[in-house]
């Protein structure tokens, strides 16, 4: 048998925000029901992690040996915390798209960790915020974006935006 | 290391123009909003302008507004501030420092760079 | 514009002793979204200003606890518990509130007695 810290070795996690409990259960991508030491882990998911809070989860199963796989858990920030806000200036509406994801509440997370990406159609964007210019006027575009913490995606979210009507004469 | 290294300053007549740089290294320069804030002969502590993480939005107190620029190379992990029609009273020491954003802090500030506006 | 006065503008203490430092806004700075973003500032001889607290009362990390800031609306305090002589320079107020007219405070001058 493997040990269960080779086996585990490359253990991947999803983290899920529950907004009513502003807490986070991580899902622990493995193909078999795992345990979790001290930590109680139902369905390969840890729960009631506190934003911003390091746990340390011990990884076994019966299909592995001593020792155990130490995972530690990089919990990320309040989703709430982040809103994506159309940073679009009015007069520039017709071939302008800005969008930004503000910070509205400050969390002890390095901000060092966070990293925003923004795909519109083809156009891939590693920023917190994005100016698309010289675009067609009256046309639907879709911005999808994300915010991953330690390379984890927490949170996401699209917008579609329609550009105003060109100005007579243009 | 987590660093803002300001230069360009000089001694520069009244009504001249300066530019001054901030170099920025050890963070994601992109994701921070940055400013500049100065420090008078006085030591009073005068904030002067503020751009976005991506250069969208800029802000100047109205006794820099229309002689200040404020500007950003998110490429280069460089912030500027071009300063014209200088006057005595923009005599001062240059820090530039990041807020991840406007409802946050100055976490981190260069060592300045000095202006002085003199005949 | 809001305007941030500091008091006093020196303040000579003795190490071990408690220093309190007061700060006042000319109109309140609570945000509508219901925070205050009150911060405090220590410059040291020969540097930059360094962040000591921000929203009012909250430290920031590696900020030792014998620095404690307080108050509400337009009134703000910040306590050192037991000055040390690593804590003399001086001492800057700021409002972020009111974005983007950022303001400092006069600043106060803490030095040995």
């Known amino acids: 048998k493997p040990t269960c810290d080779e086996k585990y070795a490359n253990i991947t996690v999803d983290y899920l925000y529950n907004k009513e409990t502003k807490l986070f259960t991580a899902k622990l991508n493995v193909n078999e029901d795992v345990e979790c030491g001290n930590n109680t882990c139902t369905n390969n998911e840890v729960h009631n992690l506190t934003e911003c809070k390091n746990a340390s989860v011990s990884i076994s199963h019966n299909s592995c040996t001593a020792p155990d796989k130490t995972l530690i858990l990089d919990v990320p920030p309040g989703v709430e915390k982040f809103q994506l806000h159309d940073c679009t200036q009015v007069e520039k509406a017709d071939t302008t798209i800005c969008l930004k994801w503000k910070n509205i509440e400050t969390f002890t997370c390095d901000t060092q960790n966070i990293t925003y990406r923004f795909q519109c159609g083809n156009m891939i964007f590693d920023n917190k915020e994005i100016k698309l210019e010289n675009l067609e006027p009256e046309h639907e575009y879709k911005c999808d974006s994300e915010i991953l913490y330690n390379n984890h995606k927490f949170t996401n979210a699209s917008k579609i935006i329609k550009t105003d009507f060109g100005s007579p004469g243009e | 290391e987590v660093q803002l290294v300001e230069s360009g300053g000089d001694l520069v007549k009244p009504g001249g123009s300066l530019k001054l740089s901030c170099a920025a290294s050890?963070?994601?320069?992109?994701?921070?909003?940055m400013s500049w804030v100065r420090q008078t002969p006085e030591k009073r502590l005068e904030w002067v302008a503020y751009?976005?993480?991506?250069?969208?939005?800029?802000y100047y107190p109205d006794t820099v507004k229309g002689r200040f620029t404020i500007s950003r190379d998110n490429a280069k992990n460089t912030l500027y501030l071009q300063m014209s029609s200088l006057k005595s009273e923009d005599t001062a020491m240059y820090y530039c420092?990041?807020?991840?954003?406007?409802?946050?802090?100055?976490?981190?500030w260069g060592a300045g760079t000095t202006v002085t506006v003199s005949s | 514009d809001v305007l941030m006065t500091q008091t006093p503008l020196s303040l000579p203490v003795s190490l071990g002793d408690q220093a309190s430092i007061s700060c006042r806004s000319s109109?309140?700075?609570?945000?509508?979204?219901?925070?205050?973003?009150l911060e405090w500032y220590l410059q040291k001889p020969g540097q930059s200003p360094k962040l000591l607290i921000y929203?009012?009362?909250n430290r920031f990390s590696g900020v030792p606890d014998r620095f404690s800031g307080s108050g509400s609306g337009t009134d703000f305090t910040l306590k050192i518990s037991r000055v040390e002589a690593e804590d003399l320079g001086v001492y800057y107020c700021?409002?972020?509130?009111?974005?983007?007219?950022?303001?400092f405070g006069g600043g106060t001058k803490l030095e040995i007695k």
């Open positions: 420092a990041r807020r991840y954003d406007v409802w946050w802090y100055f976490d981190v």
């Open positions: 050890g963070f994601a320069f992109s994701n921070y909003d």
């Open positions: 751009i976005s993480s991506g250069g969208v939005s800029t």
């Open positions: 109109q309140s700075i609570v945000h509508s979204n219901g925070n205050t973003y």
């Open positions: 929203k009012v009362s």
């Open positions: 700021f409002q972020g509130s009111h974005v983007p007219m950022y303001t």
